[in-house]
Interface confidence: low
Amino acid sequence: GELETSDVVTVVLGQDAKLPCFYRGDSGEQVGQVAWARVDAGEGAQELALLHSKYGLHVSPAYEGRVEQPPPPRNPLDGSVLLRNAVQADEGEYECRVSTFPAGSFQARLRLRVLVPPLPSLNPGPALEEGQGLTLAASCTAEGSPAPSVTWDTEVKGTTSSRSFKHSRSAAVTSEFHLVPSRSMNGQPLTCVVSHPGLLQDQRITHILHVSFLAEASVRGLEDQNLWHIGREGAMLKCLSEGQPPPSYNWTRLDGPLPSGVRVDGDTLGFPPLTTEHSGIYVCHVSNEFSSRDSQVTVDVLDPQEDSGKQVDLVSAS
């Protein structure tokens, strides 16, 4: 006869490991007992259990409560056992020794491999600001046994670098994603994808990118200077910019205080019926935590009684 087993048994941390050992004997042969031992322990073999044809299963104190027989029906020639709740310390080499009658003793070895699925973590890099060079957007670390694979899934253009630290029974893999921040990246997802044989499916952690920026400011409302005449109602100037974080707006008049009756409503400056006192240089100041921008315009309110048109200047500064 001969023993049938597996070269390698692979289980995920916390699962039950079936250690197979089946004696395929000739007709009339019987199995008297099957002894299981761990044989890669520091000081010789460590007994797990004894499976006796007459007295049943006896588990050594070191494995009390962790070694069982597979559920019935059982073949009397099957010496397989279950190792409950595999921990990483169980990883190693095991031996079954089968005593048969009348053929004598047989032994076989297998290796138990315990997969430790990773628990990945994603750490965002420093705050991203437009104008920076190549900057760390995020790093993703996963530790497991064997070493996990860490990749990135994103539409954003960038570069990745990985490093791995091997430990006694596991390996930690860290992958970093670097990019050159631009405003178009705002709100884009950056997903760390961790693959591992102990995972049923890839683990994904998504980080939403935030890039601080502030666009140039410009003022709208003076496109048709002929509309800016004495008595006109509903005249307004609107300051245009965009940014992340969203900017705040402030209006001032360069050549004096804002005239009475002029309403400031965020990015909009609303005028009462126009008079010549509304002529002047108006400044829109746009700011967020990242930067600030100014745009100034000169308003000349036309007097229809006068024949000559006045010039309107737009000047933008930052």
Epitope: E64, V87, A89, F165, H167, S168, R169
Partner: antibody, heavy 117, light 108 residues
């Protein structure tokens, strides 16, 4: 048979640096396991200080991180502890040990360190 | 950080009695707890790993139990040679570790 043995000065003055050596026999420190330093204070408290792995990676107790360094000499099968800026509160018995996250299975006999001027 | 609290600080028992040491973790650590015996003028000795797993060469009177946050080391029939300090240690926070404050065993 795995054996570990600590050696060091016994007495160190405050603000100086402490250097201890752990000599390992019966097992190569580059084969497997982590190689730890643990100390026992007079008040009967054990404190894990840090370790160097078989591959040379080090991890330290966050409370000591700014002062501690663990290195090894693989040719001699030694590993070392250096603790900077010692105070009287570092007076303790220092142990080296072998282990990982299933416990510390082999320990040295310990070396007593007194910090005093 | 995971803190381990051992109680009581001192246990006093008569030879032959059963004694239990308690260790409580500040958060769920599964079974990632190990127990050590530290005799005066000796080195700590690993008694139990992963809460209940026996260690080769350790007398069978030592046993461990528990999971989650509450753990117990028991000696089912105390002998005079068991006079020592007993410490629990967690490895859930690998690659860093912490010990409990210890319990001193005295013989009446």
């Amino acid at each position: 048979q795995v054996q570990l043995k600590e050696s060091g000065p016994g007495l160190v003055k405050p603000s100086q640096s402490l250097s201890l050596t752990c000599t390992v026999t019966g097992y190569s420190i580059t084969s497997d396991y982590d190689w730890h330093w643990i100390r026992h204070f007079p008040g009967n408290m054990l404190e894990w200080m840090g370790y160097i792995s078989f591959s040379g990676r080090t991890y330290y107790n966050p409370s000591l991180k700014s002062r501690i360094s663990i290195t090894h000499d693989t040719s001699k099968n030694h590993f070392f502890l250096r603790l900077n800026s010692v105070t009287t509160e570092d007076t303790a018995t220092y142990y080296c040990a072998r282990g990982n996250y299933d416990g510390f299975d082999y320990w040295g006999q310990g070396t007593t360190l007194t910090v005093s001027s | 950080d995971i803190q381990l609290t051992q109680s009581p600080a001192i246990l006093s028992v008569s030879p032959g009695e059963r004694v239990s040491f308690s260790c409580r973790a500040s958060q769920n650590i599964g079974t990632s707890i190990h127990w050590y015996q530290h005799r005066t003028n000796g080195s700590p000795r690993l008694l139990i790993k992963f809460a209940s797993e026996s260690i080769s060469g350790i007398p069978s009177r030592f046993s461990g139990s528990g999971s989650g946050t509450d753990f117990t080391l028991s000696i089912n029939s105390v002998e005079s040679e068991d006079i020592a300090d007993y410490y629990c240690q967690q490895s859930k926070s690998w690659p860093t570790y912490t010990f409990g404050g210890g319990t001193k065993l005295e013989i009446k």
